[in-house]
Amino acid sequence: WELTILHTNDVHSRLEQTSEDSSKCVNASRCMGGVARLFTKVQQIRRAEPNVLLLDAGDQYQGTIWFTVYKGAEVAHFMNALRYDAMALGNHEFDNGVEGLIEPLLKEAKFPILSANIKAKGPLASQISGLYLPYKVLPVGDEVVGIVGYTSKETPFLSNPGTNLVFEDEITALQPEVDKLKTLNVNKIIALGHSGFETDKLIAQKVRGVDVVVGGHSNTFLYTGNPPSKEVPAGKYPFIVTSDDGRKVPVVQAYAFGKYLGYLKIEFDERGNVISSHGNPILLNSSIPEDPSIKADINKWRIKLDNYSTQELGKTIVYLDGSSQSCRFRECNMGNLICDAMINNNLRHADEMFWNHVSMCILNGGGIRSPIDERNNGTITWENLAAVLPFGGTFDLVQLKGSTLKKAFEHSVHRYGQSTGEFLQVGGIHVVYDLSRKPGDRVVKLDVLCTKCRVPSYDPLKMDEIYKVILPNFLANGGDGFQMIKDELLRHDSGDQDINVVSTYISKMKVIYPAVEGRIK
């Protein structure tokens, strides 16, 4: 019996087609992805093959103005239109709190939404009961397939799930659900979830009875043969893991942003054992036409976005200096504003020992693309912020050793004075450079804001200590020559859309007046 698994993950609000790098589509003839194009391909496969499941491994939420405006309603609407069979909860599904998940998505989705390792407690337990499930058994042709969900146990540090959801260890939570499915006579089981490729592989190895793992969170691109675009494969598709009980378990993921549709064919024997598996992600490029009815629906929903982008978010009473003449040479107040917004967006998990789990921000000056003049009645709009941050990136959470941070700050000024983009703007950091010294030895003082303290204060950076830092995904991926961050980071979790982070902060503050205050000397 053969099953075709179509899968997406980390779509992050890319409802419209995008450019090849998943930013805003400029030249339509070279654009990719989007739900209208995805629907064309899905329908083509559904017509051609008998047993097809369309699955999403989480993080549909967060990433473009679509999510900012529609807050998840767009996800439910278009996933319903594409007739997804199941979805696992990702960490970003909690970005607007539990209510922001329940109302727009859980209550509106016509497909099961899954996570076995999220347990509700207190007053939330009855409110959310039945709205998401640990598993679902789906009829496929004359057979049934069990889908069991999981979500990153780091979600409380990455999003806003509140205090009434407990995120358990994935493997510990999955095993009893898989055992139950097996005992209920479900002999074909897919683990669908959002914890990253390393955890996906562990699940394949450790959870007895799981036949296939469909993952997300780490934006992993797997491919067999010559890859069709810019993404470099992290391994073959499917990636085969030998389980502890000796089975060969295929593990798949489909990069991110709806650029690819994962396509996996699995052959099962009559007892539900995997005989063979093969496939590849399908690049959703312009050779695949956009479905006209979905496209028309997208255009209808688009109207509200255009109106939103010109509305006032808040006011500035000072000039927001985002000029390259400032931000690539010295501390600039636009850099301070953005870093303050980045930290504010990550305020969570205070306890008696930590005022917050992260206090530091770094931001490449070259990523700040425009100033905002306060003389337009002080008004700040989404449109203004899109000029400052035009690349459609995210502000991510990483863990780095102090020694890596020191290297990053040396790199920041290794060729100072040439108006290059690697000059770092900061938050929660005081750095002093001596530019008379030779490159690689110019950082003379580097103090960082404590987190394990009731009164935050600046302490010298310790080389062997592990620090959490918020930074643009561009830097986490080694951009602007920050290879040491990419090579030495100990953990990387994708965060929220950059413009959204700043716009939320400005809306919250109402009036802003960021200063140049001696963070960089």
């Epitope: 039945g130 058994v137 009829p139 049934v144 055992d179 139950k180 097996k182 005992t183 209920l184 006579n185």
Partner: antibody, heavy 120, light 107 residues
Framework: QVQLVESGGGVVQPGRSLRLSCAAS????????MHWVRQAPGKGLEWVAV????????YYADSVKGRFTISRDNSKNTLYLQMNSLRAEDTAVYYC?????????????WGQGTMVTVSS | DIQLTQSPSSVSASVGDRVTITCRAS??????LAWYQQKPGKAPKLLIY???SLQSGVPSRFSGSGSGTDFTLTISSLQPEDFATYYC?????????FGGGTKVEIK
């Protein structure tokens, strides 16, 4: 032919124990999940417990959890139900039933039943 | 736990009558419902599985329908051997549960 035969029922005092057996024949016993279902006099059917084909997974009705233990010996083609701390409300005909191989579980083969009476 | 509520609890009918028994689940169980017939002093016998599939050897006058929460067992033309008690059963999740039963009696 395919059949299930229960034994071990009888009259027992409250708080005491009893062990039921179910001998299977005519099919590959080790391929099937096996169940106990009971029926109190004049009442409906109540599912009691299940054990998976190889015996590693077991599930129980809340009414018997912690008191009853289901087990199997695939080499002897036999299913067991160890009943401890028996109560008057456990009085019933106990059937063993084969859960067939497809989902959802339905019981396609039943034993004739064995009567358990809990009375002082 | 998933509760199954059968109605009516008993029905009087004559040979040749069409008899309909309903079973309502306390939550969505897709089409994962079975029906059994039990005669006094005997073990139950499987009639219908997956809501509407007829078990082999069961006469075609028995049929099942429904999905989600509402299910029906229909006997199109009651025969003398059909006077018995009928139970619905779900195995969507543990614990497996049965309906309270419907007794079909001779009018």
């Amino acid at each position: 032919q395919v059949q299930l035969v229960e034994s071990g029922g009888g009259v027992v005092q409250p708080g005491r124990s009893l062990r039921l057996s179910c001998a299977a024949s005519g099919f590959t016993f080790s391929h099937y999940g096996m169940h106990w279902v009971r029926q109190a006099p004049g009442k409906g059917l109540e599912w009691v417990a299940v054990i998976s084909d190889e015996g590693s997974n077991k599930y129980y009705a809340d009414s018997v959890k912690g008191r009853f233990t289901i087990s199997r010996d695939n080499s002897k083609n036999t299913l067991y139900l160890q009943m401890n701390s028996l109560r008057a409300e456990d009085t019933a005909v106990y059937y063993c039933a084969r859960g067939w191989l497809r989902y959802p579980i339905a019981f396609d083969i039943w034993g004739q039943g064995t009567m358990v009476t809990v009375s002082s | 736990d998933i509760q199954l509520t059968q109605s009516p609890s008993s029905v009087s009918a004559s040979v040749g009558d069409r008899v309909t028994i309903t079973c309502r689940a306390s939550q969505d169980i897709s089409s994962w419902l079975a029906w059994y017939q039990q005669k006094p002093g005997k073990a139950p016998k499987l009639l219908i599985y997956a809501a509407s599939s007829l078990q082999s050897g069961v006469p075609s006058r028995f049929s099942g329908s429904g999905s989600g929460t509402d299910f029906t067992l229909t006997i199109s033309s009651l025969q003398p051997e059909d006077f018995a008690t009928y139970y619905c059963q779900q195995a969507n999740d543990f614990p497996i549960t049965f309906g309270g039963g419907t007794k079909v009696e001779i009018k």
